[in-house]
Interface confidence: low
Amino acid sequence: EEELQVIQPEKSVSVAAGDSATLNCTVSSLIPVGPIQWFRGAGPGRELIYNLKEGHFPRVTPVSDPTKRNNMDFSIRISNITPADAGTYYCVKFRKGSPDVELKSGAGTELSVRAKPSAPVVSGPAVRATAEHTVSFTCESHGFSPRDITLKWFKNGNELSDVQTNVDPAGKSVSYSIRSTARVVLTRRDVHSQVICEVAHVTLQGDPLRGTANLSEAIRVPPFLEVTQQSMRADNQVNVTCQVTKFYPQRLQLTWLENGNVSRTEMASALPENKDGTYNWTSWLLVNVSAHRDDVKLTCQVEHDGQPAVNKSFSVKVSAHPKEQGSNTAAENTGTNERNIY
């Protein structure tokens, strides 16, 4: 007589998480009499998935009516597939007895579950850094399957290449996670810059997921200071200005000191943005020259974003003839304050 064959026509089936999976199985003969059972895995630790005669398998239904006379189709449908359902499924024929005896197994069908990656979450450095410094951004996405995945980093639309990416675990798993770190060298124009982590996966059908981070959260642009004296007024008052330029973020405190003594303290607020996202601020101080016998040393002291204070000093010459003092005289400084074209 013809030898019984248990036919599982598909070596593998791939299903998106949440969908139903159909695992096909037919037998070549009705003889000998005995049940068909479905298992996940092989060997002694295998897991019973479906047995018509007994048990409760709410997510598993037979494709054909197994009670129908001369039925040779023992395919099953598993609903609401999750990554945990991945594995190799075997259709096994038993000979009726007490107990039933395993007669023959199909070759097995490997069920792989396509699970979408979670939305990428991008995190930046804990503390701000200044231009020229390298900062790291991290991108994480979880729960995807199969393992193959592509992750790219962009800064303002340009792909970054100083990137390190790991997919875990290295071995076989029901689902995987990806973690990538991108190193970005900051420039002073990065207040308006953005880094994007882009994840492409077979489950996304060509529409990658993106996570973003604004470099404004990571950058500090230190201010430029310039102290200048305007022309002497008729009432013997000198107007001295402290120009604080090209700084970010806006958190800034300015203190005027006259001969080392605090004269006035101001906090920057509601400043208009420069084109590059930085801020400028000008503070004025009126000095009554006639109230001083000696030259007055004025200091503009700026504390920016919790950093150590930066000072710029200027001496108002009381001995000089007031009316002859030139307008817009720049304070002496340790370095040039000009910018080339900005």
Epitope: A131, G157, T187
Partner: antibody, heavy 116, light 110 residues
Framework: QSVEESGGRLVTPGTPLTLTCTVS????????MHWVRQAPGKGLEWIGI?????ATSYATWAKGQFTISKTSTTVDLKITSPTTEDTATYFC?????????????WGPGTLVTVSL | QIVMTQTPFSVSAVVGGTVTIKCQAS??????LAWYQQKPGQRPKLLIY???TLASGVSSRFKGSGSGTEFTLTISGVESADAATYYC????????????FGGGTEVVVK
């Protein structure tokens, strides 16, 4: 405010050569500096930058072939192992205060000829 | 990496006429673009930065426009002194770039 290159000469292939850019009227602690070259009859080719803090970046083709360094008033470009294709006029140019943007002060250039 | 492509390679102009030079960036560079003029045997000179801002001392006959990936330099009322090679340059970023300059456009004035 000006920059001027020096050190260009005729060298044989493989002989290292260092070009110097001397700046005046401004401080290298306030401005990034670039090196740009131009082969005879060809266009401008950016080589690299040295930032105010001393960090450097190079064009993809220039990495390993050139080294940029600086002192308080000079910026050096070392051509590690010149080939005939490095024959060009080499310019240094002042960039922006603390990063990269445009070049508004250029030196007159210094000619390097690499020949056997 | 950002690649700058300039067209045409060479252009002829008549005195009093208008010349248009185009520059294309392979990526969106916003307004971070400059134009330079270089006469034979001389150093380059900055004409325009931030795509449309005239550099100090440059004639208003030079006009820059565009943003993103397409940029134009227009020279109106061409003079014989405008004969030179013009280069565009992206000021956006220098990580992983081959060259920040376009290939150049020679302007010949007749």
């Amino acid at each position: 405010q000006s920059v001027e290159e020096s050190g260009g000469r005729l060298v044989t292939p493989g002989t290292p050569l260092t070009l110097t850019c001397t700046v005046s009227g401004f401080s290298l602690s306030n401005y990034a500096m670039h090196w740009v070259r131009q082969a005879p009859g060809k266009g401008l080719e950016w080589i690299g930058i040295i930032y105010t803090g001393g960090a450097t970046s190079y064009a993809t083709w220039a990495k390993g072939q050139f080294t940029i360094s600086k002192t308080s008033t000079t910026v050096d470009l070392k051509i590690t192992s010149p080939t005939t294709e490095d024959t060009a006029t080499y310019f240094c140019a002042r960039g922006d205060r603390d990063g990269y943007a445009y070049f508004n002060i250029w030196g007159p250039g210094t000619l390097v000829t690499v020949s056997l | 990496q950002i690649v700058m492509t300039q067209t045409p390679f060479s252009v002829s102009a008549v005195v009093g006429g208008t010349v248009t030079i185009k520059c294309q960036a392979s990526h969106n560079i916003g307004s971070w673009l400059a134009w330079y003029q270089q006469k034979p045997g001389q150093r380059p000179k900055l004409l325009i930065y931030d795509a449309s801002t005239l550099a100090s001392g440059v004639s208003s006959r030079f006009k820059g426009s565009g943003s993103g990936t397409e940029f134009t330099l227009t020279i109106s009322g061409v003079e014989s002194a405008d004969a030179a090679t013009y280069y565009c340059q992206q000021g956006y970023g220098i990580s992983y770039v081959h060259n920040v300059f376009g290939g150049g456009t020679e302007v010949v004035v007749k």
